[in-house]
């Protein structure tokens, strides 16, 4: 049966035994800045091109055991959520991966900047269709990272990022705080904000919308046919990157402002239990859970 | 995220160091009264001191970025400091990434074309 997260983002009239769109997002390229990935996983094989870009810090600790499957875990799962054959949102989207996070899931602002610059240069050298950049990472507020995101957005690129898993104001983190970036918080199957131990999804006025981000089934790097469930605002952001890819594939001329408006317009409204957020943040936090558009563009979205 | 609202620095730390151009007799000294700023991550554990992104003013060309980076290295060397230019940015933001002692920040902030300098910091998978 259809995983809860795909059911949640699918308009009611398309909810059958399986998630419908076989070719959603085919005109769009999604760049993923994350860990290394297992590109021969059955979910994403032939859909993800691993670029030669790599800029990561050394792993912490003296006893670290580097295992390919662990190094690839985060990125492989997210690539699967965006465009996986069985459990992906935009099954037609092609992806390109850049490695900016090490085997422990840690990167640097400078490495991320160089990655964003790489994408811009690639765009200039070989202009293609609409581009979506998925940034499933967060650090402290960074003026320079936000500025780079702003420049890339002004070049027509759609940037989607994780709000952060710190149960805190997203405005204190980057790239979540960059106004031009679409910042995504995480909700669960009960439309509750996701709790991750003592921490949980970030919130506040720098969040644009929420999306499924708890117990998300996706590609596991343990083997080429394995699946695993993961949680976090990265998974939520991957859903929105997939939805954005489908919207842009249907309407390639959409501006960032129009795409943002559509994402908000088609979201489920006022379903999140706001009591989870600190009192002073409730009015500032958008009560929106991302969803695909209904039948308005039936022929475009569900080919 | 959340467009249409003014940028929020939150706890973001900003050290504003006034530019003084009497040192080194800079040929391309910035206009009087302008200040370049230094920024670092508000969360100390995520700071990566020793690596800095030097961001130059918006219209700075690649050749000027390279020249500014070389000038920093030369001035640092005169003071007995080793520096390493790790990357020169162009395409998105003009500037360069430099590995150097924090002692050189005041010097770097006085270089021509410098808009601000940010200490590198960690980002994490979410």
């Amino acid at each position: 049966s259809i995983p809860w997260n795909l059911e949640r983002i699918t308009p009611p009239r398309y909810r059958a035994d399986e998630y419908q769109p076989p070719d959603g997002g085919s005109l769009v390229e999604v760049y993923l800045l994350d860990t290394s990935i297992q590109s021969d996983h059955r979910e994403i094989e032939g859909r993800v091109m691993v670029t030669d870009f790599e800029n990561v810090p050394e792993e912490d600790g003296t006893r670290f055991h580097r295992q390919a499957s662990k190094c690839d875990s985060h990125g492989t799962h997210l690539a699967g959520v965006v465009s996986g054959r069985d459990a992906g949102v935009a099954k037609g989207a092609s992806m390109r991966s850049l490695r900016v996070l090490n085997c422990q899931g840690k990167g640097t602002v400078s490495g991320t900047l160089i990655g964003l610059e790489f994408i811009r240069k690639s765009q200039l050298v070989q202009p293609v269709g609409p581009l979506v950049v998925l940034l499933p990472l967060a650090g402290g507020y960074s003026r320079v990272l936000n500025a780079a995101c702003q420049r890339l957005a002004r070049a027509g690129v759609v940037l989607v990022t994780a709000a952060g898993n710190f149960r805190d104001d997203a405005c204190l983190y980057s790239p979540a705080s960059a106004p031009e970036v679409i910042t995504v918080g995480a909700t669960n199957a009960q439309d509750q904000p996701v709790t991750l131990g003592t921490l949980g999804t970030n919130f506040g006025r720098c969040v644009d919308l929420f999306a499924p981000g708890e117990d998300i089934i996706g590609a596991s790097s343990d083997c080429s046919t394995c699946f695993v469930s993961q949680s976090g605002t990265s998974q939520a952001a991957a859903h929105v990157a997939g939805i954005a890819a489908m919207m842009l594939s249907a309407e390639p001329e959409l501006t960032l402002a129009e795409l943002r408006q559509r994402l908000i317009h088609f979201s489920a409204k006022d379903v999140i239990n706001e009591a989870w957020f600190p009192e002073d943040q409730r009015v500032l936090t958008p009560n929106l859970v991302a969803a695909l558009p209904p039948s308005t563009h039936e022929n475009l979205y569900f080919q | 995220g959340a467009m249409g609202q003014e940028d929020e620095d939150g706890d973001y730390e900003e050290l504003v160091l006034a530019l003084r151009s009497e040192e080194d007799g800079l040929a391309e000294a910035p206009e009087h009264g302008t200040t370049a700023t230094f920024h670092r991550c508000a969360k100390d554990p995520w700071r990566l001191p020793g690596t800095y992104v030097v961001v130059l003013k918006e219209e700075t060309h690649l050749s000027q970025s390279e020249r500014t980076a070389r000038r920093l290295q030369a001035q640092a060397a005169r003071r007995g400091y080793l520096t390493k230019i790790l990357h020169v940015f162009h395409g998105l933001l003009p500037g360069f990434l430099v590995k150097m002692s924090g002692d050189l920040l005041e010097l770097a902030l006085k270089l021509p074309h410098v808009d601000y300098i940010e200490e590198d910091s960690s980002v994490f998978a979410q």
């Epitope: 055991h65 131990g197 003592t198 | 100390d44 554990p45 994490f124």
Partner: antibody, heavy 122, light 110 residues
Framework: QVHLVESGGGVVQPGRSLRLSCAAS????????MHWVRQAPGKGLEWVAL????????YYADSVKGRFTISRDNSKNTLYLQMNSLRAEDTAVYYC???????????????WGQGTTVTVSS | QSVLTQPPSVSAAPGQKVTISCSGS????????VSWYQQLPGTAPKLLIY???KRPSGIPDRFSGSKSGTSATLGITGLQTGDEADYYC???????????FGTGTRVTVL
Amino acid sequence: QVHLVESGGGVVQPGRSLRLSCAASGFTFNSFGMHWVRQAPGKGLEWVALIWSDGSDEYYADSVKGRFTISRDNSKNTLYLQMNSLRAEDTAVYYCARAIAALYYYYGMDVWGQGTTVTVSS
Amino acid sequence: QSVLTQPPSVSAAPGQKVTISCSGSSSNIGNNFVSWYQQLPGTAPKLLIYDYNKRPSGIPDRFSGSKSGTSATLGITGLQTGDEADYYCGTWDSSLSAYVFGTGTRVTVL
């Protein structure tokens, strides 16, 4: 309900070995780093060891390095502490504790078990 | 020998405020997140504060944390008899690659 339950404590002679277990329930075990912390009678807390969520890295206090080994079985939701060459000064209540977050292991510990007592005595 | 130093004891009357200091160095408190733990008599420790000043849900706002340089402080306002306990600060030490606890402070409500 989030729960950590330690077991395996007891009285052991110096130089012998003991293996402690910590059964976790109520949360996604493989998403969190895990610690062992001990408290000698009438004394303060002493950190013993930490293991990453996926078992890829371990850290130890100098006082136990080379003698104790932390490990985990994510399929069984269980944390272990293998204690070899035990000494009288290892006598303590041993607590397992969950790291606040998987990646930011240095944030501290948010969930603690009730502890299991280890007595090293001849 | 703990690398984080706390006063052995502090006391105050009910309703009053107490502060507990935790002194370290640049390799621990200066550059790492500080947490505070409460250990009531005969029980396991409990997290009170993390990331210098954040409270887990369920911890009343009478408890607060702050950091300045290489020292951290726990504040308890509106002291109650139920607050009688041992309090420990804790943080990662980058030089030792180890988590370190403070020496502990016993809070007595007069």
